[in-house]
């Protein structure tokens, strides 16, 4: 028996369902009574789900996993993982034993999009050219950690005087706060881009400082 899984990581959004694909080629005359199928967490060897002795033994992992019972006889040993969490991220091993055995591992990459950044200014009034201001760009509830880029109105990257912090909440999602300290010109636009490296999703925020009231 040869077990096959996806070489590419399976990317799943937090709170959605994911399918970890695993397949084998059954011989003619194969019956489920012969099948021993085990899914485990690769790194800790913890049992996730199993099908042995002709029946589905159920989920051993937070009751959020399921097989595709009607497709097993065709060699589909895929695992459904429901309501994906950050803590589900990692490698899963699919072990299949009939007359002989084989196994393969597939990686699950969890992701969550970042919110549109909110921009704040300090100080936020009586601003004059030459003043030092602090612009904060905040984006929430994303995963994995974000990449943050700042640019001026001409699209020139601003790399000096940038401090970015990322804090995980109780669900493992990150809130990102990036602070740019800049000396004001006569007027200008400052934009922040928060990128999710897995989803290749960009969230933009900008602030324009003129002699008039500020625009965000």
């Amino acid at each position: 028996v040869e077990v096959q899984v996806s070489e590419d990581p399976v990317v799943a959004l937090v709170d959605t369902d994911a399918t970890l694909r695993c397949s084998f080629s059954p011989e003619p005359g194969f019956s489920l009574a012969q099948l021993n199928l085990i899914w485990q967490l690769t790194d800790t060897k913890q049992l996730v789900h199993s099908f042995t002795e002709g029946r589905d033994q159920g989920s051993a992992y937070s009751n959020r996993t399921a097989l595709f019972p009607d497709l097993l006889v065709q060699g589909n040993a895929s695992l459904r993982l429901q309501r994906v969490r950050v803590t589900d991220e990692g490698s899963y091993t699919c072990f299949v034993s009939i007359q002989d055995f084989d196994s393969a591992a597939v990686s699950l990459q969890v992701a969550a999009p970042y919110s549109k950044p909110s921009m704040t200014l300090e100080p936020n009034k009586d601003l004059r050219p030459g003043n030092m201001v602090t612009i904060t760009c905040s984006s929430y509830q994303g995963y994995p950690e974000a990449e943050v880029f700042w640019k001026d109105g001409q699209g020139v990257p601003l790399t000096g005087n940038v401090t970015t912090s990322q804090m995980a909440n109780e669900r493992g999602l990150f809130d990102v706060h990036s602070v740019l300290r800049v000396v004001l010109g006569a007027n200008g636009t400052y934009s922040c881009l928060v990128r999710n490296p897995v989803l290749q999703q960009d969230a933009h925020g900008s602030v324009t400082i003129t002699g008039q009231p500020l625009t965000f």
Partner: antibody, heavy 117, light 109 residues
Framework: EVQLLESGGGLVQPGGSLRLSCAAS????????MSWVRQAPGKGLEWVAY????????YYADSVKGRFTISRDNSKNTLYLQMNSLRAEDTAVYYC??????????WGQGTTVTVSS | QSVLTQPPSASGTPGQRVTISCSAT????????VSWYQQLPGTAPKLLIF??QRPSGVPDRFSGSKSGTSASLAISGLQSEDEADYYC???????????FGGGTKLTVL
């Protein structure tokens, strides 16, 4: 073809350090746990260290705990074993091993480490 | 002292059947997870049997079995190229470590 190629072995004095590397090819390295297993001259196999697929989980044999460090670079498909405070009893052939489920399905050809003054 | 005990040596003549045992000396070893490795002279070990089953490519002259706290490797129709060291191994969940038997040197007379 699945292959593991160890390098970095050699002669080192007691108390010295050495870093072994293992280049993996032919499989999705980032998805698999890996181990180092050694074999002293004329002796049996002895497991040394284990690392999970992402590198976050590591386990060590008592005989090397605190002296050896297993690590991996999934972007380079490479496994490492940093060996410090080496002793004569660390003299062995060191094998890089791919794990799957509860067995070791692929072994490298081994690299020889000799600790002697 | 290994928690998996193997006889240090075994022998047989060509065509014979030889059995090598692997006994667990502590109760928390799962005999259903025992794997067997063959190490031909001067080469790296190779997976031979897992949980009494062969991976594809291993001749059916090699077979595994288990009983109680012991696992066994049987080689039927012994051939000169079977002369090698044979090791049993298992993962110990309680210690998070691999455990190897001491190895059995098989001589084909």
């Amino acid at each position: 073809e699945v292959q593991l190629l160890e390098s970095g072995g050699g002669l080192v004095q007691p108390g010295g350090s050495l870093r072994l590397s293992c280049a993996a090819s032919g499989f999705t390295f980032r998805s698999y746990a890996m181990s180092w297993v050694r074999q002293a001259p004329g002796k049996g196999l002895e497991w040394v260290a284990y690392i999970g697929s992402s590198g976050g989980t590591t386990y060590y044999a008592d005989s090397v705990k605190g002296r050896f460090t297993i690590s991996r670079d999934n972007s380079k498909n490479t496994l490492y074993l940093q060996m410090n405070s080496l002793r004569a009893e660390d003299t062995a052939v060191y094998y890089c091993v791919k794990e799957s489920y509860y067995y070791m399905d692929v072994w490298g050809q081994g690299t020889t480490v000799t600790v002697s003054s | 002292q290994s928690v998996l005990t193997q006889p240090p040596s075994a022998s047989g003549t060509p065509g014979q059947r030889v059995t090598i045992s692997c006994s667990a000396t502590i109760s928390n070893i799962d005999i259903n997870r025992v794997s067997w490795y063959q190490q031909l002279p001067g080469t790296a070990p190779k997976l031979l049997i897992f949980n009494s089953q062969r991976p594809s490519g291993v001749p059916d002259r090699f077979s595994g079995s288990k009983s109680g706290t012991s696992a066994s490797l049987a080689i039927s129709g012994l051939q000169s190229e079977d002369e090698a060291d044979y090791y049993c191994a298992t993962w110990d969940d309680s210690l998070n470590s691999w455990v190897f038997g001491g190895g059995t040197k098989l001589t084909v007379l």
